[in-house]
């Protein structure tokens, strides 16, 4: 017997007093257990389990499925056991089909034998087709065949446990088995939208997509900063074996203010984990933010192309949006779209397009947007620089010579004297009189400026040139003099 | 061939003591419960004792007869039983036998020729 | 100690005789009951196991029955071979205790 010491409780003994035991179908099973401290028989084979309390189990006719363990315990919790296989010709394999493998693990085919002195326990396809070449596996009669490091490509494989009873070949039942994927890789996470926008009172609603190879990836919505329990609703889909789906979507029936802020969908699995964010800002009524791409003030040249660009965010969609000079609305000339075709897109732009400019058409350029909650406009002030044109050119009753010249912007006037039949007028006069004459008029037409010189001062034959000119260009009107005598001669001005 | 040979009997004063081996060979020893079974001269058998296999943890039991003065033991590395025999008496002569149990049964399925011992002054 | 009483304990019969053997068990021994041949000067041949179960070699002649306490051993048609001593044995709970033996001899 094993040394035990006095006063040390020892395992109960088993009678017959056998590791393992065959009992014929019909027999009796008889198992007696002496132990002082007798407390109770167990049996167990696949998923059931019986227990008597009597020392002595007794089963008067054996059948197969009184195949199993059979343990003994006393009240020290110590056991001893023995194994009876019930020997049935008719029922050589004990079966529970059900068969699931963890890729990469060892798995179990649960075929046990009645009758462990039969030959050649092994797994054999269904049909005669043959095992995978790299399907390796142990067998035990007591419990079934093991399957060695189970693979993906193993998945609905169609088995039978086999041996060979007194010559023969013998198959239990078909086993179907069902591969659960190992994780080799962090869930794949995506969210509906990156950024949502809503106005107070309104339906937030976000769907996160976690894509992995089984259904027990871990996915949950979480709120930043926050250990609230979202309320999410699941719906999942098995594309194939090895490819699930599952979406979770999570909702706030009436968004207020507070819930702005960034949620979190987070999925792992024995690989790793993996997430994703969208962002909820909640306003509590729409908005309008215009922003000029070009300075509000524009000056351009006559005859030139301008371009009036504006960007802007709209929350929510603008509904109506317009170009506006002199009371007249733009009906061709602009475009407006929106900045990108994302579907969270609250910035657009709108072009107002203004070609070969006339003098007349400087001012006010009013570009006008509005949606449900506001309205916002914006100005743009156009300038068109003109050359500056000689209005008059005129001798007064009084001897002056004056010269009236418009542009934008405005232009200053010159005078120049030159003597004899000289081209080129290079000394200078200055003026007795100036004056800007519309300078309290409308702010963007032309600038009309006047100028005077006392025609008395010359004193020889030549020509004076009034030289009106501004960043654009100059025009020129000449005035010719001719003396006869003392007398001067009628002035004939020229341009 | 599948067989045990029992050695060591003999003559042997009462009070001394006496080794018994067992060899077997053509089977795998160590998977087995062992037995001795002795029969004096002109009578019946009498099972003197067994020693379970690894699976059974080598637990031992013996007849009242003999219980306290003989010794089961096993060397499964030399395919080997012992009986060792002490403070013999005369009664304990007789032709012992070293006998096999079957994996999945407790009966004698295979049984030396046996070895004489003698306990006589 | 579970006893094992044996019946008869010799007898004679002739070749081609049909002959039985009985085992009784001082308690219940379930199936837990083998049979063996011994001829003199050789050691014992087990021929019944389990009660009923025919050990492999065992010439079909040889059968057993019983259950509990009271087991037969039965030759049905004797052979010059089968002239030995035949012991029965319990093995439900050791000590493994042999019936005493029963010679079957030529008439």
């Known amino acids: 017997q094993p040394s035990v010491s006095p006063g040390e409780p020892s395992p109960p003994s088993i009678h017959p007093a056998k590791s393992e035991l065959i009992v014929r179908v019909g027999n009796e099973i008889r198992l007696l257990c002496i132990d002082p401290g007798f407390v109770k028989w167990t049996f167990e084979i696949l998923d059931e389990t019986n227990e008597n309390k009597q020392n002595e189990w007794i089963t008067e006719k054996a059948e197969a499925t009184n195949t199993g363990k059979y343990t003994c315990t006393n009240k020290h919790g110590l056991s001893s056991s023995i194994y009876v296989f019930v020997r049935d010709p008719a029922k050589l394999f004990l079966v529970d089909r059900s068969l699931y493998g963890k890729e990469d693990n060892d798995t179990l085919v649960r075929c046990p034998l009645t009758d462990p002195e039969v030959t050649s326990y092994s797994l054999k396809g269904c049909q005669g087709k043959p095992l995978p070449k790299d399907l390796r596996f142990v067998p035990d009669p007591k419990a079934g065949i093991t399957i060695k490091s189970v693979k993906r490509a193993y998945h609905r494989l169609c088995l039978h446990c086999s041996a060979d009873q007194e010559g023969k070949s013998v198959l239990s039942d078909k086993f179907i088995l069902k591969v659960r994927p190992a994780f080799k890789a962090v869930p794949v996470v995506s969210v509906s939208k990156a950024s949502y926008l809503l106005r107070e009172g309104e339906e937030f609603t976000v769907t996160c997509t976690i894509k992995d190879v089984s259904s027990s990836v871990y996915s949950t919505w979480k709120r930043e900063n926050s250990q609230t329990k979202l309320q999410e609703k699941y719906n999942s889909w098995h594309h194939g074996d090895f490819n699930y789906e599952r979406q979770a979507t999570l909702t706030i029936s009436s968004a207020r203010v507070n819930d702005s802020g960034v949620f979190m969908c987070y999925a792992n699995n024995t690989f790793g984990s993996a997430n994703v964010t969208t962002t909820l800002e909640v306003v509590d009524k729409g908005f309008i933010n215009i922003f000029p791409m070009i300075n509000t003030t524009v000056f351009v040249n006559d005859g030139e192309n301008v371009d009036l660009i504006v960007e802007y965010e709209a929350f929510p969609k603008p509904e109506h949006q317009q170009w506006i000079y002199m009371n007249r609305t733009f009906t061709d000339k602009w475009e407006d779209y929106p900045k990108s075709e994302n579907e969270s897109n609250i910035r657009y732009v709108s072009e107002l397009h203004l070609t070969r400019l006339k003098g007349t058409e400087g001012g006010t350029y009013t570009f006008l947007v509005s949606n449900s909650d506001v309205n916002a406009s914006i100005a743009f002030n156009v300038y068109v620089n003109t050359k500056p044109e000689i209005l008059t050119y005129d001798r007064l009753v009084n001897g002056m010579l004056q010269c009236v010249a418009a542009g934008f912007p405005e232009p200053t006037i010159d005078w120049y004297f030159c003597p004899g039949t000289e081209q080129r007028c290079s000394a200078s006069v200055l003026p007795v009189d100036v004056q800007t004459l519309n300078a309290s008029g409308p702010p963007f037409g032309k600038l009309v400026v006047q100028s005077s010189i006392d025609s008395s001062a010359f004193k020889h034959n030549g020509t004076v040139e009034c030289k009106a000119y501004n960043d654009v260009g100059k025009t020129s009107a000449y005035f010719n003099f001719a003396f006869k005598g003392n007398n001067k001669e009628q002035i004939h001005p020229h341009t | 061939e599948v067989q045990l040979v029992e050695s060591g009997g003999g003559l042997v004063q009462p009070g001394r003591s006496l080794r018994l081996s067992c060899t077997a060979s053509g089977f795998t020893f160590s998977d087995h419960d062992m037995n001795w079974v002795r029969q004096a001269p002109g009578k019946g058998l009498e099972w003197v004792g067994r020693t379970r296999n690894a699976a059974g943890s080598y637990t031992t039991e013996y007849a009242a007869s003999v219980k306290g003065r003989f010794t089961i033991s096993r060397d499964d590395s030399k395919n080997s039983l012992y009986l060792q025999m002490n403070s013999l008496k005369t009664e304990d002569t007789a032709v012992y036998y070293c006998a096999r149990e079957p994996k999945y049964w407790i009966d004698f399925d295979l049984w030396g020729r046996g070895t004489l011992v003698t306990v006589s002054s | 100690d579970i006893q094992m009483t044996q019946s008869p304990s010799s007898l004679s019969a002739s070749v081609g005789d049909r002959v039985t053997i009985t085992c009784r068990a001082s308690q219940s021994i379930s199936s837990y009951l083998n049979w063996y041949q011994q001829k003199p000067g050789k050691a014992p041949k087990l021929l019944i196991y389990?009660?009923?179960s025919l050990q492999s070699g065992v010439p079909s002649r040889f059968s057993g029955s019983g259950s509990g306490t009271d087991f037969t051993l039965t030759i049905s048609s004797l052979q010059p071979e089968d002239f030995a001593t035949y012991y029965c044995q319990q093995s439900y709970i050791a000590p493994y205790t042999f019936g005493g033996g029963t010679k079957v001899e030529i008439k």
């Open positions: 389990a009660a009923s």
